[in-house]
Interface confidence: low
């Protein structure tokens, strides 16, 4: 139904707390350099205005669209051009072009310092002093670093953060209570960020149809007892929610997500037997819980997929009659039978099935032509299964850090032109797949591994788009989203690359490395490893291991030395010489 005042409608639906949080996220995602105080001031102004519209929907400007209202606020910021350069040109445009312009200027890799967590005592003091401001800072800092973070889900993580602080700040040993819990939230939030970015990429590059196909596959796996009409309805609603969030329409997105959660809980009988626990929770927890609910038990009497999609004499007629519905039902039927496959794999199979029908239905004897299609799926299924086995075996042998290093070597050889910080970030993220997925039961490994890798590689593609340097990466990133991971996996050593000359300063370290946290130490060592591979792209695993072991020994020795500086300055050059010799 149409509302006289959109802003009043959303304020009433969402309530003041969520309304303010979402507006803060929206502004922080659009203008990523502004301080918290600048954004907090705008949020308060927007909220005060919304309240006047709630009181009187006919008041001045209350009938304006949210894009108009928010865009006008952003464009009124002083020194916009000085701080944001050409983004200020967006303000010369009219809606909807102005909002599109803002979206295009979102920066996936803003030059902001890492989000440092204050020490426990200081955190608890500022949290107790003003919990609202404290959580506002959290929303602002995460949103500006992750401009496509799923806004209602960020509110959920802020709520988690709040609960952890409330609990731990009351304890004697705040540090040991906070650290593991906040690390857990951070890890989950970072995974949520790359997953959502992948969804927005799908929407931006390939449109709603592509996202809806992803949703049909995912929902069919989770709710195998829901019929096709139900899955289609849920996929349509989920597509709308994600389109809104990816498009910066965060109030509408959060409101529609709440509606979808309400619908699912009211229609559990037709969707899944596993929803009740989620439905008993309050809104943010409920929606989060539903998004990762366990798969329902598969119906026991599902007929073989071949009956309707291969053996039926009417396949081509049915396909021609309504292509999208026919392919949608194929994807639904295949996905509900295969919770053990990744969504990416299911979409590749559906694509293969579509291509087969396109080819075969134009031939003289279609059934003879498409009769072998299910057998032709086999290599497509085997490839990711082998990938999972090989990589999980390697992870179990090397542990997370060693596994990250193996991936770093592999990817530096595939794309040595990519900047070392990007390669290190990608390898560290890709390497976490081991800890995240390889410990799961066998039937959950493949979907976990492949869908996670796809999301991480999407980030690699986004960063590479800004400054394209590798033809290998460009080739893999230009194709469809579901083909990216197999494309990257198939890449070999880039033979066109001219090795980097050896620079001693790249491998020169100082005593300050000794006091760094373990994670930072690892990053320093991995940076050196990537540089070694760029210098010698065809170095063997043994050569690289020799050098890295020597390097680790050098750090250990010098960091334990009485005079660390002298040790680094005298032993460092010897290490460099040994490295050069080992790689000669």
């Amino acid at each position: 139904e149409a509302h006289k005042s959109e802003i009043a409608h959303r304020y009433n639906d969402l309530g003041e707390q969520h309304f303010k949080g979402l507006v803060l996220i929206a502004f922080s995602q659009y203008l990523q350099k502004c301080s918290y105080d600048e954004h907090a001031k705008l949020v308060q102004e927007v909220t005060d205005f919304a309240k006047t519209c709630v009181a009187d929907e006919s008041a001045a400007n209350c009938d304006k669209s949210l894009h108009t209202l928010f865009g006008d606020k952003l464009c009124a910021i002083p020194n916009l051009r000085e701080n944001y350069g050409e983004l200020a040109d967006c303000c010369t445009k009219q809606e909807p072009e102005r909002n599109e312009c803002f979206l295009q200027h979102k920066d996936d890799n803003p030059s902001l310092p890492p989000f440092e967590r204050p020490e426990a005592e200081a955190m608890c003091t500022s949290f107790k002093e003003n919990p609202t401001t404290f959580m506002g800072h959290y929303l602002h800092e995460v949103a500006r670093r992750h401009p496509y973070f799923y806004a209602p889900e960020l509110l959920y993580y802020a709520e988690q953060y709040n609960e952890i602080l409330t609990q731990c700040c009351a304890e004697a040993d705040k540090e040991s209570c906070l650290t593991p819990k906040l690390d857990g939230v951070k890890e989950k939030a970072l995974v949520s960020s790359v997953r959502q970015r992948m969804k927005c990429s799908s929407m931006q590059k390939f449109g709603e149809r592509a996202f809806k196909a992803w949703a049909v596959a995912r929902l069919s796996q989770t709710f195998p007892n829901a019929d096709f009409a139900e899955i289609t309805k849920l996929a349509t609603d989920l597509t709308k929610v994600n389109k809104e969030c990816c498009h910066g329409d965060l109030l509408e997105c959060a409101d529609d997500r709440a509606e979808l959660a309400k619908y699912m809980c009211e229609n559990q009988a037709t969707i899944s037997s596993k929803l009740q626990t989620c439905c008993d929770k309050p809104l943010l927890k409920k929606a989060h819980c539903l998004s990762e609910v366990e798969h329902d038990t598969m119906p026991a009497d599902l007929p073989a997929i071949a009956a309707d999609f291969v053996e039926d004499q009417e396949v081509c007629k049915n396909y021609a009659e309504a292509k999208d519905v026919f392919l949608g039902t194929f994807l639904y039927e295949y996905s509900r039978r295969h919770p053990d496959y990744s969504v990416s794999l299911l979409l590749r199979l559906a694509k293969k099935y579509e291509a087969t029908l396109e080819k075969c239905c134009a031939e003289a004897n279609p059934p003879a032509c498409y009769g072998t299609v299910l057998a032709e799926f086999q290599p497509l299924v085997e490839e990711p299964k082998n990938l999972v086995k090989t990589n999980c075996d390697l992870y179990e042998k090397l542990g997370e850090y060693g596994f990250q290093n193996a991936i770093l070597v592999r990817y530096t050889q595939k794309a040595p032109q990519v900047s070392t910080p990007t390669l290190v970030e990608a390898a560290r993220n890709l390497g976490r797949v081991g800890t995240k997925c390889c410990t799961l039961p066998e039937d959950q490994r493949l979907p976990c591994v492949e869908d996670y890798l796809s999301a991480i590689l999407n980030r690699v593609c986004l960063l590479h788009e800004k400054t394209p340097v590798s033809e290998h990466v460009t080739k893999c990133c230009s194709g469809s989203l579901v083909e990216r991971r197999p494309c990257f996996s198939a890449l070999t050593v880039d033979e066109t690359y001219v090795p980097k000359e050896f620079k001693a300063e790249t491998f020169t370290f100082h005593s300050d490395i000794c006091t760094l946290p373990e994670k930072e130490k690892q990053i320093k060592k991995q940076t050196a490893l990537a540089e070694l591979v760029k210098h010698k792209p065809k170095a063997t695993a043994e050569q690289l291991k020799t050098v890295m072991d020597d390097f680790a020994q050098f750090l250990d020795t010098c960091c334990k030395a009485a005079d660390k500086d002298t040790c680094f300055s005298t032993e460092g050059p010897n290490l460099v010489t040994r490295c050069k010799d080992a790689l000669a």
């Epitope: 019929d227 009988a269 007929p303 039926d312 009417e314 396949v315 309504a322 026919f326």
Partner: nanobody, 115 residues
Framework: EVQLVESGGGLVQPGGSLRLSCAAS????????MSWVRQAPGKGPEWVSA????????RYAESVKGRFTISRDNAKKTLYLQMNNLKPEDTAMYYC????????GSQGTQVTVSS
Amino acid sequence: EVQLVESGGGLVQPGGSLRLSCAASGFTFGSFGMSWVRQAPGKGPEWVSAIDSGGADTRYAESVKGRFTISRDNAKKTLYLQMNNLKPEDTAMYYCTIGRSTSRGSQGTQVTVSS
């Protein structure tokens, strides 16, 4: 848009008969197996019967075997359920569904068996 519209329900005495119909539109009816599902007041949905896309393979729940017959007319895009020797425990809302699931995505038709 996928639509399933059931009809033919009503009030009948024990031992009586009814024939339910389900008119399908918005998808290629002849490509899909179909089912009948029912839901009694205060109970979860219960799968009743299923038929494959061509109409050759039919399945029934133990509770209705020998009394109910499922059939389809692909030309008319219609699914049927012939119910004979009805019992009070057959009282429920009846739904047709795509595939072989216990979910319902339509309005259903009420069947009441009572003396």
